[in-house]
Interface confidence: medium
Amino acid sequence: EPAVYFKEQFLDGDGWTSRWIESKHKSDFGKFVLSSGKFYGDEEKDKGLQTSQDARFYALSASFEPFSNKGQTLVVQFTVKHEQNIDCGGGYVKLFPNSLDQTDMHGDSEYNIMFGPDICGPGTKKVHVIFNYKGKNVLINKDIRCKDDEFTHLYTLIVRPDNTYEVKIDNSQVESGSLEDDWDFLPPKKIKDPDASKPEDWDERAKIDDPTDSKPEDWDKPEHIPDPDAKKPEDWDEEMDGEWEPPVIQNPEYKGEWKPRQIDNPDYKGTWIHPEIDNPEYSPDPSIYAYDNFGVLGLDLWQVKSGTIFDNFLITNDEAYAEEFGNETWGVTKAAEKQMKDKQDEEQRLKEEEEDKKRKEEEEAEDKEDDEDKDEDEEDEEDKEEDEEEDVPGQAKDEL
């Protein structure tokens, strides 16, 4: 039977407001609202916590019955949908011990684990997996790419009691390995032998100058010479113009700096490798994975552009159950969500096409009107000219 420590699907309307606590550490934290967003697979099932104000910190958390993951697997899972086409903002969760004062949660509150996607500009598109080990936040040494599209994605972290881990996105493994190898929790197992040093006669030069090679006698020629084809202009006046000097050209016989040819170094010993010894500071820790106390799940984020929706939170000790839960939530609505988005995009495209068409027709109609006005003006002008032409002879007659 799986142990489900925390599960939140926001299926009871405003009920979530009694389970989630806003931090009062800052007066201007952003507000979360319950929403399934502009597009969804199922309007009710896809309701989650949505960030609603741009350029804000967000700090909201929910507590649960405290537990320890000692001797058992820990699975943390949730869905994130950046429907605002996020450019900079967190989509991660933090797991805290139950000693956290939820009303004072903030960016420096000590947590056990931080996990989830983080995007900021072109440089950051990663899944954070940070463990607090002996009071220090230790980041994973691998780069795990997160999803940066507008759709809902399922993020899963599995931490096992054999000190191995797995990260899944959309129920597919994207990274796995050992905690000791992929984080710098412990000093290295091996260190360079402090008593060893490179022997003085160790020659690391693969090639050397050929000692038998010497510079040819005719090697040294100037780089530039006076142009032998240049002639003093006939109108050159030395008193006025000074002494005539021919222009300088590149010397075709110039050979540059002479270097002796290279030969294989007969004394070459290769690159000296510093011998390693067991690090006396190293001692294995079989309980890196273990925490005495988990009691709060928190959203402690900053977002440039709001609109991210968090849903389907799960903390359990059962990998299979988590996978099944993911398939029954995210898995069931993802196709319909894409369908609705595609439909909206198509409607938007048609609307824009229609507007473009209408605008062009209006412009054409305006142009036509202008042309007609222009033609009328030209006709009026012609009539006026004709009238004037008829008047002139008449005037002349009267004057005669």
Partner: nanobody
Framework: QVQLQESGGGLVQPGGSLRLSCTAS?????FGWYRQAPGKQREFVAN???????RYSDSVKGRFTISKDNAKNTVYLQMNILKPEDTAVYYC?????????????WGQGTQVTVSS
Amino acid sequence: QVQLQESGGGLVQPGGSLRLSCTASGSIAAFGWYRQAPGKQREFVANMYVGGSIRYSDSVKGRFTISKDNAKNTVYLQMNILKPEDTAVYYCNALVRFEGRNDDYWGQGTQVTVSS
């Protein structure tokens, strides 16, 4: 600690232009401009990341341009074809990010009024 200093606001007629400046001290991941009209929420206008990518809100796209002078550590917002609805206090924002932590810093704001 990051300090931000905005300048360039003022009164301008509809269709006119203004250039806002924001000078920063410190190492910054992203610069942004936001605005707040009386009685309204602060809203995103434009931003620019260290890597060079730029984003604008739909309401200013094609009219406003964000740019940066790296030597002066100054970010600019060139505002053209201004409309009365662009009237607001404009704030410069700098985002500093480190190991999953964020710190944001705000300027004191500069008033832009578009009116005939």
